[in-house]
Interface confidence: low
């Protein structure tokens, strides 16, 4: 189920599947909650620890059971990710953080006249993933009211300072806040060209532009169909990104797919999870559990439920079969998405339902330790 | 790789292709990504090549004929082999990689955990070896990255196997009595994960072996646990962020 | 410098014994395997026996195995031969050496002793 | 066990002639195979290992060549020096040496 809480002064030992830089717990929550594999995270405030390399230090954890132990250190705030808690889930994040310096890649400077202005730019500018803004009181005067649009590889800043009168913050583009509008069209029959920034495996093209729409750094992406000639690139989802933001060229090519990412959608943007089942597919990856259900859509709830499942196969065939339940497996991979799709077998496979944000979770047991 | 079977895109996240650039450019090694910015792999792989100015790395790619004058790489800003590697010896043969830039973690660029310090009570018993290395004694560099599932051997057993070698504790072997599964040349370097606990870990480096795959001569392997002092030591004292490890 | 020193050789009867010593200076006696190699008046090379590093593992030519014990002692850095049931064909001239364990090459005999005589005769 | 058998058994030369000397093993011993030269009342030192590599300090007039069960020692161009017996030794399966090669003055 949905656990909010929050322990302060803890840090879970162990278990770390990535780490980064976030100005707050709540925002390295939300990393946890989009990250494929983590469950719990753990974030050292800067007034926490001394040492400057692992301040804002913002970690990922996964365990096989759920949970890791606990230490005590001061400042830290530990928790779990956001899976399953229904609308909770959002990718959007609209705080602003004063006194703090969010670097990375620093593509565009411009004089603006308010912190908002300058988040406003970023979230109407398609590369930009944060930005970083000099207030009139800045010590340097020639750096005075400079707003910096950033980018960074994945999508968090590469160090976070401490540093007076600079206030840094997010792109709006997940709270779909964009001015830049998105292309809803998918192109039949058409190969994108440029930087290929991940390559996952999808079963179908709407799958991939959901990965693409909530990969930091996907702006368009192209889907090789299943009857793809090359065998090893069937069911290839590869996420793009270019310069310019768009495609540089585009090449008519059978059995792919191409299209853009709708994080800057004006309106809402997809959940992100996919919930359609695939009748006659496979979805390879590691074992996690294999229990008899009744069912495909029982099998997905089952998968649901269980917070490390990712995806879902339910075999059809006689073998695999008790009376009215059959085997439901259940399943995980490194990144989230199946690592072999196979097609004409007898049973149907999909998703977790985890990262839907329409489940009602009504149980939000938010609690945080005593101050 | 002998006896291995094509691995699939972000299998082995943490994988990354060491290639030389002379006149013509080519795999010499393989490697583990252990941090945004650092690469373990062995020391023997720059035996005569410790310029880090003719290396190009290559991460999150499973096809290295995909690689093309436009595919990024990774510089090395420095090149760390072990104080206690000898050329003519087997013993340490490990060596960390800095990079001249921090590589971004996707779904196909991921570090590979690091054992504990000493780990010898951990019993694994799910382990593979990855390489774009020879598939026989004498054969080529394969294209797409392969992966063998191999058991542990005891230093005892892996003793006996190779009598003219002292096998230390520092080093630890894999391989099948019948042979025909094991690292060959240029897989060195690279990896030998385990899975422990649902955890994939770094166990040891692809090191040396009589042959490829002979029957009762393991592959050997640098014992990753034995050395965690000296990679915390090394990856933290050198400038620049260390691989984020839990500082619990 | 790295150097092997035999010693204990000498004239011995037909079903005697007698004890070799190899001294090891000069390197890291207890990392390589040791190597006991004769030579009989006028004749070739021959290999007698081999310990490696631990001690753990000793092996014999055919021609002694039964006969001669090789054994080690780490922390005096030498090496050693028991010589029993001696026969008149053991006479030679025993030299100890060293193999650098090289990895991935396998070396062959870098470093020999001078050697020492061992004369079976009644 | 692998027999090394080595052939000649002597051979005369002068200084200046390129020499060759044969070793063939009873087994495939892949490359495993060192060269030795032996002077009277000396130990043997090594010349060359792993069938062709030249042992540091070794002059390059010295070469080795083969793999599998045919190996060959050449001296390109006999020094005064050289006038000595040879071995070749199989490591391959524990150590075996050849019966050697005399090289003498012709």
């Known amino acids: 189920g949905c656990l909010t809480q929050l322990y302060e002064n803890a840090f879970f030992r162990g278990g770390d599947v990535a780490s980064m830089y976030t100005p707050n717990a709540q925002y390295c929550q939300m990393r946890c909650t989009f990250h494929p594999r983590c469950l719990l995270f753990s974030f050292l405030p800067a007034s926490s620890i001394n040492d400057m390399e692992k301040r804002f230090g913002c970690f990922l954890k996964d365990s096989v059971t759920g949970t890791l132990p606990k230490v005590h250190r001061t400042g830290a705030v530990s928790g779990h990710s956001l899976k399953q808690c229904g609308h909770q889930i959002s990718a959007c994040h609209r705080d602003i953080y004063k006194g703090v310096d969010m670097r990375g890649v620093n593509f565009n400077v411009s004089k603006v006249s308010s912190v908002e202005e300058c988040q406003k730019r970023c979230t109407s500018n398609i590369r930009c993933q944060f930005f970083s803004y000099a207030t009139q009181t800045f010590h340097k005067a020639e750096y005075r009211n400079n707003c910096l649009l950033k980018y960074s590889p994945g999508g968090t800043p590469t160090a976070i300072k401490v540093l007076s009168n600079v206030e840094s913050g997010f792109s709006l583009k997940p709270c779909a806040l964009s001015e830049i509008g998105c292309h809803m069209n998918i192109f039949q029959h058409l190969a994108f060209s440029d930087v290929d920034v991940a390559r996952v495996l999808t079963p179908d093209a709407f799958v991939c532009r959901t990965i693409c729409t909530y990969h930091p750094n996907c702006l368009f992406f192209t889907f090789y169909t299943n009857v793809w000639k090359i065998e090893s690139q069937r069911n290839v989802c590869l996420l793009k990104t270019s310069e310019s933001g768009t495609p540089s060229s585009s090449t008519p090519q059978e059995n792919t797919i191409s299209g853009y990412s709708l994080l800057t959608c004006k309106r809402t943007l997809p959940e992100p999870c996919h919930s359609k089942i695939y009748p006659g597919v496979d979805f390879g990856g590691e074992e996690l559990n294999v229990t008899f259900v009744k069912g495909v859509n029982v099998c997905q709830e089952t998968c649901t439920k269980m917070i490390r499942c990712q995806f879902f196969t339910y075999s059809l065939l006689p073998e695999d079969c008790k009376e009215e339940k059959c085997k439901c497996f259940l399943r995980l991979s490194m990144d989230g998405s199946p690592t072999r799709i196979a097609y004409g077998t007898q049973g149907s496979s999909g998703y977790s339902l985890r990262l839907c944000n329409t489940g009602d979770n009504s149980v939000c047991t938010t609690k945080t330790s005593t101050r | 790789i002998v006896g291995g079977t094509n691995s699939s895109w972000g299998e082995w996240p943490w994988q990354v292709s060491l290639q030389v650039k002379l006149t013509a450019q080519r795999h010499l090694c393989g490697g583990s990504l252990i941090g945004h910015q650092w690469v373990l792999t062995a020391a023997h792989c720059f035996d005569g090549l410790p310029l880090q100015d003719v290396w190009r790395i290559y991460s999150g790619i499973l096809n290295l004929s995909d690689i093309t004058k436009d595919t990024p790489f990774s510089q090395i800003k420095e090149i760390i082999i072990h104080q206690n590697y000898k050329v003519s010896e087997g013993n340490h043969d490990i060596a960390l990689i800095k990079l001249q830039a921090p590589l971004n973690y996707t779904e196909f660029q991921k570090p590979i955990c690091l054992p504990s310090k000493g780990d010898t009570s951990t019993i694994y018993t799910n382990c593979w070896v990855t390489g774009w290395g020879f598939s026989k004694e004498k054969g080529e560099i394969q294209n797409i990255l392969q992966k063998v599932n191999i058991p542990l051997v005891t230093n005892e057993e892996c003793q006996k196997r190779y009598q003219d070698y002292k096998i230390t504790q520092r080093m630890v072997c894999a391989g099948y009595k019948e042979g025909g599964k094991d690292a060959c040349k240029g897989d060195s370097g690279g990896p030998l994960v385990c899975k422990h606990n649902g955890m994939w870990r770094l166990v040891g480096i692809t090191s040396w072996g009589e042959g490829c795959a002979r029957r009762e001569q393991p592959g050997v392997y640098t014992k990753v646990a034995e050395y965690m002092d000296w990679i915390l030591e090394k990856t933290q004292s050198s400038d620049g962020k260390a691989q984020m490890q839990s500082p619990a | 410098e790295v150097q092997l020193l035999e010693s204990g050789g000498g004239l011995v009867q037909p079903g005697g014994s007698l004890r070799l010593s190899c001294a090891a200076s000069g390197f890291t006696f207890s990392h390589y395997i040791m190597m006991w190699v004769r030579q009989a008046p006028g004749k070739g090379l021959e290999w007698v026996s081999g310990?490696?590093?631990?001690?753990?593992?000793?092996v014999y030519a055919d021609s002694v195995k039964g006969r001669f014990t090789i054994s080690r002692d780490n922390s005096k850095n030498t090496l050693y031969l028991q010589m029993n049931s001696l026969r008149a064909e053991d006479t030679a001239v025993y030299y100890c050496a060293y193999r650098r364990t090289g990895v991935p090459r396998r070396d062959s005999f870098e470093i020999w002793g001078q050697g020492t005589m061992v004369t079976v005769s009644s | 066990d692998i027999q090394m058998t080595q052939s000649p058994s002597t051979l005369s030369a002068s200084v200046g002639d390129r020499v060759t000397i044969t070793c063939r093993a009873s087994q495939s011993i892949s490359s495993w195979l060192a060269w030795y030269q032996q002077k009277p009342g000396k130990a043997p030192n090594l010349l060359i290992y792993k069938a062709s590599t030249l042992e540091s300090g070794v002059p390059s007039r010295f070469s080795g060549s083969g793999s599998g069960t045919e190996f060959t020692l050449t001296i390109s161009s006999l020094q005064p020096d050289d006038f000595a017996t040879y071995y070749c030794?199989?490591?391959?399966?524990?150590?075996?040496f050849g019966q050697g090669t005399k090289v003498e003055i012709k």
């Open positions: 310990i490696y590093s631990s001690g753990g593992i000793t």
């Open positions: 030794q199989q490591y391959n399966t524990y150590w075996t």
